[in-house]
């Protein structure tokens, strides 16, 4: 019986010869825990591990700390891969983060960070980002320096309010900050003047709720 091959991310899947978009099973080294992730094998050379996707409002993103920790949703559709997996993965080697955005007028934009990692759960999965390029704003819509992750049951933001309860969704809220890609999904023609929507301030402003978002990571040397 042949040895079971395991992949830590979609870059390894790609390099093994699997170059078709789809859901793959990933396992961290020295771990038996498996996660199912969508791999984008076409965009920008492929090998992208999708860690978040919004596209139609089919999944509720107002979830608990534990749910954001382990992940939820459908990897073929809307989902969150899981903070614990992403934290462990991004602390093993250097990763880039690409955030792809779609508005309701048919426009697309992206933000690319040349270095991305999440701190451990003990440090509230704080986000760390460096080196922004892209078309979705010259200023980072994820506050810098990075903030701790907050959910409806874990208020780690810098506001005298509770950002996650008010804006909905788990995110690296400041007070409350220029973005929230896990906010309430609003359909077309109901997506403006919505402070609790899917926001990327330095592309579309404060009250605009986006049509679609994808957060994807890949090793820096890929």
């Amino acid at each position: 019986k042949g040895e079971q091959i395991s992949f830590r991310d979609c870059a390894e899947v790609f390099k093994s010869g699997h170059t078709t978009n789809g859901v793959y099973t990933l396992t961290l080294p020295n771990s038996t825990e498996e996660v199912k992730a969508y791999c984008d094998m076409e965009a920008g050379g492929g090998g992208w591990t999708i860690i978040q996707r919004r596209e139609d409002g089919s999944v509720d993103f107002q979830r608990t700390w534990k749910e954001y920790k382990v992940g939820f949703g459908n990897p073929s559709g809307e989902y969150w891969l899981g903070n614990e997996f992403v934290s462990q993965l991004t602390n093993q080697q250097r990763y880039v983060l690409k955030i792809h955005l779609k508005d309701w007028e048919g426009n697309e934009a992206y933000s690319l960070y040349e270095h991305f990692y999440l701190s451990s759960e003990e440090l509230n999965y704080r986000i760390h980002l460096k080196g922004l390029t892209g078309t979705a704003g010259k200023i980072s819509s994820i506050s810098q320096p990075g903030n701790d992750f907050s959910t409806k049951d874990a208020d780690n933001d810098k506001c005298i309010c509770k950002c996650s309860q008010m804006l909905t969704g788990g995110w690296w809220f400041d007070a409350c900050g220029p973005s929230n890609l896990n906010g309430m999904y609003y359909p077309q023609r109901q997506n403006t003047n919505k402070f609790n929507g899917i926001k990327w301030y330095y592309w579309k402003g404060s009250g605009y709720s986006l049509k679609g978002t994808t957060m994807m990571i890949r090793p820096a040397g890929f």
Partner: antibody, heavy 122, light 112 residues
Framework: EVQLVQSGGGVVQPGRSLRLSCAAS????????MHWVRQAPGKGLEWVSY????????YYADSVKGRFTISRDNAKNSLYLQMNSLRAEDTAVYYC???????????????WGQGTLVTVSS | DIVMTQSPLSLPVTPGEPASISCRSS???????????LDWYLQKPGQSPQLLIY???NRASGVPDRFSGSGSGTDFTLKISRVEAEDVGVYYC?????????FGQGTKLEIK
């Protein structure tokens, strides 16, 4: 610690001008919309003016429109209210106030300055 | 402009007893995003106002849990479960759903 320190109040004759200042510290001033709210002696609160984080959006109460000008200098972390053609009914304590939430989300006033008294009298 | 009407205007309360303040608006404050842009502020004697409740029912950090806000549309209530001496001052409701923002006339809470 968030602080809003006001200055510039005083006694002024009707028809004259006065400029109020509000120096901000302890937060990223350029990310927040700011307001002026006033309170006539022994009376309630009245909103006066708003300026967005970048200064691109400005609103005034009808009672001061055309006479008062709100402005900000994000490099100096400062908010201003230029008051011209002052009237006796403008006599009040003027407060600067910061939006609760950043990036121009209007959900109330999370922090207030200490207030400065403007007295318009001949 | 939206008219905000508070009652009572004066509220004498015995320490340890509950208190309730009503705020009514001349139009609905329910925004299309499902939130009521209704805040409550307390102005203690000789001090600047301070935020107590935002978006109708959300307590600001540092505000004791004896304070609670409720209501939707045009009728809102601020409740203090057990009044303490430090709660004296003037309470204001303020709406931000419709421009310009407008305040209620204030309710003066005093200790009996």
């Amino acid at each position: 610690e968030v602080q809003l320190v006001q200055s510039g109040g005083g006694v002024v004759q009707p028809g004259r001008s006065l400029r109020l200042s509000c120096a901000a510290s302890g937060f990223t001033f350029s990310s927040y919309g700011m307001h002026w709210v006033r309170q006539a002696p022994g009376k309630g609160l009245e909103w006066v003016s708003y300026i967005s984080s970048s200064g691109s959006t400005i609103y005034y109460a009808d009672s001061v429109k055309g006479r008062f000008t709100i402005s900000r200098d994000n490099a100096k972390n400062s908010l201003y209210l230029q008051m011209n053609s002052l009237r006796a009914e403008d006599t009040a304590v003027y407060y600067c106030a910061r939006d609760l939430l950043d990036y121009d989300i209007l959900t109330g006033y999370g922090y207030w300055g200490q207030g400065t008294l403007v007295t318009v009298s001949s | 402009d939206i008219v905000m009407t508070q009652s009572p205007l004066s509220l004498p309360v015995t320490p340890g007893e509950p208190a309730s303040i009503s705020c009514r608006s001349s139009q609905s404050l329910l925004h299309s995003n499902g939130y009521n842009y209704l805040d409550w502020y307390l102005q203690k004697p000789g001090q600047s106002p301070q935020l107590l409740i935002y978006l109708g029912s959300n307590r600001a950090s540092g505000v004791p849990d004896r304070f609670s806000g409720s209501g939707s549309g045009t009728d809102f209530t601020l409740k203090i479960s057990r009044v303490e001496a430090e709660d004296v001052g003037v309470y204001y409701c303020m709406q931000g759903t419709h421009w310009p923002p407008t305040f209620g006339q204030g309710t003066k809470l005093e200790i009996k």
